[in-house]
Amino acid sequence: MMTGTIETTGNISAEKGGSIILQCHLSSTTAQVTQVNWEQQDQLLAICNADLGWHISPSFKDRVAPGPGLGLTLQSLTVNDTGEYFCIYHTYPDGTYTGRIFLEVLESSVAEHGARFQIP
């Protein structure tokens, strides 16, 4: 039975040219996290594997930095980075947990963070 929940940074906004940290947090389960995948729509950004470390997709190598922790930092943001991002936690024995973050990249100098929310 999957008892865990994923809390994410929710709906967030950031300035064009800036950077943002995407983070998810898995709680309420004793399952071992074996791998975390970070995806943008259907594109794989990065994998963080418990045994093999980080793998950043070649097409994102220049603009993605791993961390802090299991999080992912997006750098040199463009308006094209606006959209949905997913953290996919592979765990044992529970299975897979998925969290969603919506990022809006703004042209203006005002970028406010949205509220946090939970995905069971």
Epitope: H25, T30, N49, P66, P68
Partner: antibody, heavy 117, light 107 residues
Framework: EVQLQQSGTVLARPGASVKMSCKTS????????MHWVKQRPGQGLEWIGG????????TYNQKFKGKAKLTAVTSASTAYMELSSLTNEDSAVYYC??????????WGQGTSVTVSS | DIVLTQSPATLSVTPGDSVSLSCRAS??????LHWYQQKSHESPRLLIK???QSISGIPSRFSGSGSGTDFTLNINSVETEDFGMYFC?????????FGGGTKLEIK
């Protein structure tokens, strides 16, 4: 087998600079952060900063900006830390430790630095 | 920066006792808290990751719990080889920080 082998004991004069190394083996060097941690005699652990050799991204503890410079040579699977403008406060053991998102799971044996005139 | 406060600073116990070490964060770090053991003249060793997840090769008498700001490392029936320093560390945000440590000593 994962190994982090650090360079030997250093004795330096105040005002000097030192560069220490952390040679790794047994894993993909470019897939893990390499962090550096300071420990003064009888004291706790202090995070200096880290470098991700996969893209040379660095992050520092604000306290050590201008004091420590982190670099990595991927072809040699070796990370380096240079400490500049040494003072007595820099006398400590310095550890390198790798992190792949799941805690700092392997540590070097430490490099002891003594600053004395 | 996130401040981690460990208590007690020193814990004097007899082998066979069970003990709890505390680590408190200045703000929520979810479960991004790791525990390390350091014996005299040795490098630190990862004991527990993400507050409660076990590490291969670490005896099962070590366990962790907590989330948010309050975390606990439990040692069930302390053995002589367990004496030394224990540190917590957060990986929730840069800069990473360590707690000041708890010294586990023989009574």
């Amino acid at each position: 087998e994962v190994q982090l082998q650090q360079s030997g004991t250093v004795l330096a004069r105040p005002g000097a600079s030192v560069k220490m190394s952390c040679k790794t083996s047994g894993y993909s060097f470019t897939s893990y952060w390499m962090h550096w941690v300071k420990q003064r005699p009888g004291q706790g652990l202090e995070w200096i900063g880290g470098i991700y050799p996969g893209n040379s991204d660095t992050t520092y503890n604000q306290k050590f900006k201008g004091k420590a410079k982190l670099t990595a040579v991927t072809s040699a699977s070796t990370a380096y830390m240079e400490l500049s403008s040494l003072t007595n406060e820099d006398s400590a053991v310095y550890y390198c430790t790798r992190e792949g998102g799941y805690g700092m799971d392997y540590w070097g044996q430490g490099t002891s630095v003594t600053v004395s005139s | 920066d996130i401040v981690l406060t460990q208590s007690p600073a020193t814990l004097s116990v007899t082998p066979g006792d069970s003990v709890s070490l505390s680590c408190r964060a200045s703000q929520s770090i979810y479960n991004n808290l790791h525990w390390y053991q350091q014996k005299s003249h040795e490098s630190p060793r990862l004991l527990i990751k993400f507050s409660s997840q076990s590490i291969s090769g670490i005896p099962s008498r070590f366990s962790g719990s907590g989330s948010g700001t309050d975390f606990t490392l439990n040692i069930n029936s302390v053995e002589t080889e367990d004496f030394g320093m224990y540190f917590c560390q957060q990986s929730n945000s840069w800069p990473y920080t360590f707690g000041g440590g708890t010294k586990l000593e023989i009574k």
